[in-house]
């Protein structure tokens, strides 16, 4: 997260770490005891899933290792429509006060609405520098028409833009997957935005999760 | 320091493959994509695909769909880059290209490897 | 798929001129282009991204502008080691990547 603030302690139970070995791979977010929903970029062939703690690396966090993620049919590694996955958990994820499912979304929140988005992704760019502890950074949605006006038809239907107008406050490499929380709801993954990040008024591009909740909940019943 | 190092020079007969290596040293792998680019003596450069560090996602110029394998090691952050089939027209140096971006998408090509001659001849 | 058509293909010009090269995308790439130097019997280096930010390391008497179809790179006084092969890319991020044909610069 460039440009963001140390989230408060325990306030997102839902955010998770996709690592590969003890390297950060990507954001997620738990949606029930056996499944994190991530971007479909996120795709690799097995996961080390650290829950319960806004510390990477942390040696007292829950870590379940996943074997089995199910990319939305119709991604694109072209033009990166449908940019969601499902990984199920190999074992079911212990509830807690700082282990909870997010609340997935009844509509679609309009532009203009407040938000947060969180990750443990590198603060600097292009020059990395990977945080320990989980950031965030409150943003506002923002319309299609005026997000078109930047990223022309790179933007897909089912894509969601976020920024602050004039902020460097962005999204970056590491974040991807994570949850963009609005109003309680998750309303968006991180999927993608310019580069070097926090160029001010290119907003972060995510998946935007309301159009999917029918492809979400089929896909853990089919495969529950 | 931070710099991809490529395997080394190769002559083919055609209707042969060849398999070229790059190794990526000094940056975190993972996080971004190898795209290969070939140049054809005396003339421009030419894209031939992508490919996701993590995931193996790729995409590859149309016409070498079928010739074409882009592949990668994480755990010796080295990617590789197979073409069949050879003919003469595929003599050329092949270079590969980190593909810098975040998420889904990537913008422009940062750092590049020194270059593989192969030559194709009978 | 997006063709980048480059002008000229080679120019000639003494040290200290001011050389201007262009680039122009067959349909609007927006702002999505980015400028690459190549030496003879070296790998392609990475100038200018995103139309007209300087790549780290690169001397300021490069610079780029544009947007949408038309582009250009310019050398403000060009240097004994500035003679080389100059190439855009409008990937506009989306695949197939295509590279406009080249600009030798050549000492007069």
């Known amino acids: 997260i460039i440009d963001g603030y140390k989230c408060k302690e325990g306030s997102h139970p839902w955010q998770v770490a996709l690592l590969k070995g003890n390297q950060l791979h990507c954001g997620g977010v738990l949606v029930d005891k056996y499944w994190v929903l991530t971007a479909a970029h996120c795709k690799m062939g097995q996961y080390q899933v650290q829950l319960g703690s806004d510390k990477i690396g942390d040696q007292s966090a829950q870590k379940i290792k996943a074997t089995k993620s199910f990319r939305h049919p119709g991604y694109s590694t072209k033009t990166h429509v449908n940019d969601i996955m499902l990984v199920r958990l190999d074992e079911p994820v212990k509830m807690s006060s700082k282990v909870e499912a997010v609340q997935l979304p009844e509509h679609c929140e309009p532009p203009g609405t407040s938000c947060t988005v969180s990750g443990w992704g590198t603060t600097t760019s292009p020059d990395v520098t990977f945080p320990s502890d989980l950031m965030c950074s409150d943003v506002k949605l923002i319309s299609s028409r005026e997000c078109k006006k930047v990223y022309k038809d790179l933007l897909g239907k089912t894509m969601l833009c976020a920024g602050i107008p004039d902020s460097k406050t962005n999204t970056c490499n590491g974040d991807s997957g994570g949850p963009l929380v609005c109003n309680d709801t998750l309303q968006g993954l991180v999927s993608w935005g310019t580069y070097p990040c926090g160029q001010p008024n290119d907003p972060g591009v995510y998946t935007q999760v309301c159009k999917y909740k029918r492809w979400v909940m089929e896909t853990m019943k089919t495969h529950r | 320091q931070v710099q991809l190092v490529q395997s080394g020079a190769e002559v083919k007969k055609p209707g042969a493959s060849v398999k070229v290596s790059c190794k990526a040293s000094g940056y975190t792998f993972g996080p971004y994509g190898i795209s290969w680019v070939r140049q054809a003596p005396g003339q421009g450069l030419e894209w031939m695909g992508w490919?996701?560090?993590?995931?193996?996602?790729?995409n590859y110029a149309q016409k070498l769909q079928g010739r074409v394998t882009m592949t990668t090691d994480t755990s010796t952050s080295t990617a590789y880059m197979e073409l069949r089939s050879l003919r003469s027209d595929d003599t050329a140096v092949y270079y590969c290209a980190r593909a810098a971006g975040y998420g889904a998408r990537w913008w422009y090509f940062d750092l590049w490897g020194q270059g593989t001659m192969v030559t194709v001849s009978s | 798929d997006i063709q980048m058509t480059q002008s000229p293909s080679s120019l000639s010009a003494s040290v200290g001129d001011r050389v201007t090269i262009t680039c122009r995308a067959s349909q609007s790439i927006s702002s999505y282009l980015n400028w690459y130097q190549q030496k003879p019997g070296k790998a392609p280096k990475l100038l200018i991204y995103?139309?007209?930010s300087l790549q780290s390391g690169v001397p300021s008497r490069f610079s780029g502008s544009g947007s949408g179809t038309d582009f250009t790179l310019t050398i403000s006084s060009l240097q004994p080691e500035d003679f080389a092969t100059y190439y855009c890319d409008g990937s506009y991020s989306t695949p197939p990547i295509t590279f406009g044909g080249g600009t030798k610069v050549e000492i007069k």
């Open positions: 490919i996701s560090a993590y995931s193996g996602d790729t």
């Open positions: 995103g139309a007209s």
